[in-house]
């Protein structure tokens, strides 16, 4: 049994960091194998991940760890049985990928405006809940070449656009994502999509 | 697929000492924690105590005068012991695997075995 | 020790409804917080770890949130198999658990 590709993490910059590998061949991961991560730090104590199948030889393991500091460095040893497999380190605040927001609304009753807010995923006390901006993508159920980012570069979580903008009478979905420039994050996961009737009074032509 | 099987007197007189075992099949109690977790009739939930197949243990400190929580890894079997009855006692006695440290959730449990303190 | 402390006690719901329970800790837990369902007469089932990791089998209507002291357990579309009582747990210190949350269909 071997390692084929060598394991690689990322942290939400909060208490969990996620790493994925791959194995030579098909691996029943939650049984064979055995990810031990360690703060490197007196007294600290090693913890054990067992790892869930990713794809026939991918293992992924989702890390518990106390709240990050920008200094924390861990240990990694991934086993199979007594077989050492890889040892590595991992710094958390080198390898940041934020938490998806949440709870996207689309707000339609503000007269032609669409108003979409949503949840800033990270609690005021985190480095990250100030240096997050985000991307907001909007597409047409209907039209697969209906497709438009916007580029939210404010800290506030919402976004302003003319119903106009918009075909009339369709449906639309919409979802967001985020990064953090102060650690070149890589984007977030998307947020789950939310769904709404596009509909706006067109202006009377003027003759 | 890894199962649990408490086992142990139903009945145990005020005063004595519970003991159960819980006996793991389709797995190893290798690189695991294992706990005991309590529930009186129609309440909430007790953890008592976990114990590392290397033998470490940690007791809910409510209790810790009174429980010890051993290993056979040669049986695959953990075992509980509670000193000193009383009829608070009374409960349906759950053994449970983490699924990794301590710190991560119980994923595997027994179906529980009822114990009563009475006279 | 760390209590928790679960809310609602009970609730009723419509199938489909959206449910939300929530479970605050008595100190800061990080995301070391752990949600279980428990069906009458039988074990908890592990749902979500790590306050927001769904344990593997799980249903994807559940999901969980939150991290220090307060967190959520929310069921995006309520199902009839949904009728149970559910747990929070940490698992920062001493595992203790909330009082449970009992869930009921209209």
């Known amino acids: 049994m071997k390692v084929l590709q060598e394991p690689t993490c990322v942290s939400d910059y909060m208490s969990i960091s996620t790493c994925e590998w791959k194995m030579n061949g098909p691996t029943n991961c939650s049984t064979e194998l055995r990810l031990l991560y360690q703060l490197v730090f007196l007294l600290s104590e090693a913890h054990t991940c067992i790892p869930e199948n990713n794809g026939g030889a991918g293992c992924v393991c989702h890390l518990l760890m106390d709240d990050v500091v920008s200094a924390d460095n861990y240990t990694l040893d991934l086993w199979a049985g007594q077989q050492l497999l890889w040892k590595g380190s991992f710094k958390p605040s080198e390898h940041v990928k934020p938490r998806a927001p949440g709870n996207l609304t689309v707000h339609t009753n503000v007269s032609d405006t669409l108003l979409l807010t949503w949840s800033n995923p990270y609690p005021p006390d985190n480095y990250l809940y100030n240096h997050l901006t985000y991307a907001v993508n909007i597409w047409s159920e209907n039209d697969p070449a209906d497709f438009r980012i916007y580029n939210v570069t404010y800290l506030e979580p919402s976004l302003r656009i003319a119903a106009s903008t918009l075909k009339s009478g369709i449906s639309y979905r919409a979802r967001v994502r985020a990064w953090a420039q102060c650690y070149n994050t890589t984007w977030s996961e998307w947020s789950p999509s939310t769904k709404w009737h596009n509909s706006y009074r067109e202006p009377f032509e003027q003759h | 697929q890894v199962q649990l099987q408490e086992s142990g007197p139903g009945l145990v007189k005020p005063s004595e000492t519970l003991s159960l075992t819980c006996t793991i099949s389709g797995g190893s109690i290798s690189t695991y924690y294992w706990s005991w977790i309590r529930q009186p009739p129609g309440k909430g939930l007790e953890w008592i105590g976990y114990?590392?197949?290397?033998?470490?243990?940690n007791y809910n400190p409510s209790l810790k005068s009174r429980v010890t929580i051993s290993v056979d890894t040669s049986k695959n079997q953990f075992s509980l012991k509670l000193n000193s009855v009383t009829a608070a006692d009374t409960a349906v006695y759950y053994c449970?695997?983490?699924?990794?440290?301590?710190?991560?959730?119980?994923?595997?449990w027994g179906q529980g075995t009822t114990v009563t303190v009475s006279s | 020790d760390i209590q928790m402390t679960q809310s609602p006690s009970s609730l009723s719901a419509s199938l489909v409804d959206r449910v939300t329970i929530t479970c605050r800790a008595s100190?800061?837990?990080?995301?070391?917080l752990n949600w279980y369902q428990q069906k009458p007469g039988k074990a908890p089932k592990l749902l979500i770890y790590?306050?927001?990791i769904l344990q593997s089998g799980v249903p994807s209507r559940f999901s969980g949130s939150g991290s220090g002291t307060d967190f959520t357990l929310t069921i995006s579309s309520l199902q009839p198999e949904d009728h149970a009582v559910y747990f929070c747990q940490q698992s920062y210190s001493s595992p203790t658990f909330g009082g449970g949350t009992k869930v009921e269909i209209k």
């Open positions: 449970a695997r983490h699924r990794g440290s301590y710190v991560y959730g119980m994923d595997v």
């Open positions: 790590g306050a927001s």
């Open positions: 100190q800061t837990i990080s995301s070391y």
């Open positions: 114990i590392y197949y290397s033998g470490n243990t």
